[in-house]
């Protein structure tokens, strides 16, 4: 379809790099999550940090380019880095409106399907570019 | 300062390709925004051909899909456009533009192509 | 394709007038409240020049005579007080959906 992806937008404060400039941003009033229009794909990510207690919001927007996992019409996040001890770092892409305001599920840390121990280990800075 | 410069031959012969370069100065390609190519007919209006972001992803316009090509050469800072299987209809000012977010802030100053055996 | 229709195709105009120009897409141009619809002047032998962006922002450089309003299908482009130096071409431009349109063009012309 000719309709251009909106995807959530939000980087968590601390964050480096930007993903801003692969969309347009929109003045979507105080009632709807801040909203990113995509330019290079149709196509929204997520990247949330779940830890023992919690999953944190680190990253949403949009994605510079369609690749698989884009055609989901659900945020189904994927393990992808150990950004520290006791914290993994999840991925989603999907493709509708809005698709990556929240996720469907986490696995709880440490069950089968989640990176162990001696997953990936980034260094501070670097862990949202390897999730991506 | 961000200059864009179109190149490339001036008469191109029914039933050929028309290849045409953009050199961008002042700026990497590779590091943001859409590169794209514009065209239009002598006293006539403006369409836009299709674009090639900075990560290489491409969009076309469906009237021209299947004769365009979009690419780039990162080493000579340049991107390029081939239109296959020309027509008269084909004749215009193509213009090479970086668009940031989807309007066309930067243009270069434009080539004639005429088409014509 | 959304097609964009401008009024009028030429207009005569005086240094000093008050020139509108109007744009009409064939569908709406806008994203959740936000109006994808631009503006260009064009020169002869000229590329085009970027005047207004998202319907009423003013690109840097711009002269304030010049202005944007519209949302939906219908936009307007108005120069409060005509310049010698705006006699020229104007084109809007959509980017709501791929691919990008512009509109036929207006030209300005000395009265």
């Known amino acids: 379809p000719p309709n251009r992806r909106t995807c959530v937008f939000f980087e968590a404060p601390g964050v480096q790099g930007s993903t801003k400039t692969l969309g347009e941003l929109l003045d979507t009033g105080p009632e709807l999550p801040r909203a990113i229009r995509c330019l290079y794909s149709r196509c929204c990510f997520g990247i949330w940090n779940l830890t023992q207690d919690r999953a944190q919001v680190e990253m949403q927007g949009c994605r510079d380019s369609d690749e698989p996992g884009c055609e989901s019409l659900h945020c189904d996040p994927s393990p992808r880095a150990h950004p520290s001890p006791g914290s993994t770092l999840f991925t989603c892409s999907c493709g509708t409106d809005f698709c990556n305001a929240n996720y469907s599920h986490l696995p709880p840390p440490g069950s089968p399907g989640t990176p162990g121990s001696q997953g990936p280990q980034a260094a501070p800075g670097e862990s949202i570019w390897m999730a991506l | 300062q961000l200059q864009l410069q179109e190149s490339g031959p001036g008469l191109v012969k029914p039933s050929e390709t028309l290849s045409l370069t953009c050199t961008v100065s002042g700026y990497s390609i590779t590091s943001d925004f859409a590169w794209n190519w514009i065209r239009q007919p002598p006293g006539k209006g403006l369409e836009w051909i299709g674009y090639?972001?900075?990560?290489?992803?491409?969009s076309y316009n469906p009237s021209l899909k299947s004769r365009v090509t979009i690419s780039v050469d990162t080493s000579k800072n340049q991107f390029s456009l081939k239109l296959s299987s020309v027509t008269a209809a084909d004749t215009a000012v193509y213009y090479c533009a970086r668009s940031r977010y989807s309007w066309f802030a930067y243009w270069g100053q434009g080539t004639l192509v005429t088409v014509s055996s | 394709d959304i097609q964009m229709t401008q009024s009028p195709s030429s207009l005569s105009a005086s240094v000093g007038d008050r020139v509108t120009i109007t744009c009409r897409a064939s569908e709406s141009v806008d994203t959740y409240g936000n109006s994808f619809m631009h503006w260009y002047q064009q020169k002869p032998g000229k590329a085009p020049k970027l005047l207004i962006y998202r319907a009423s922002n003013l690109e840097s450089g711009v002269p304030s005579r010049f202005s944007g309003s519209g949302s939906g299908t219908d936009f307007t482009l108005t120069i409060s007080s005509l310049q010698p130096e705006d006699f020229a071409t104007y084109y809007c431009q959509q980017s709501n959906e791929d691919p990008y349109t512009f509109g036929g063009g207006t030209k300005v012309e000395i009265k």
């Open positions: 090639i972001s900075f990560s290489g992803s491409t």
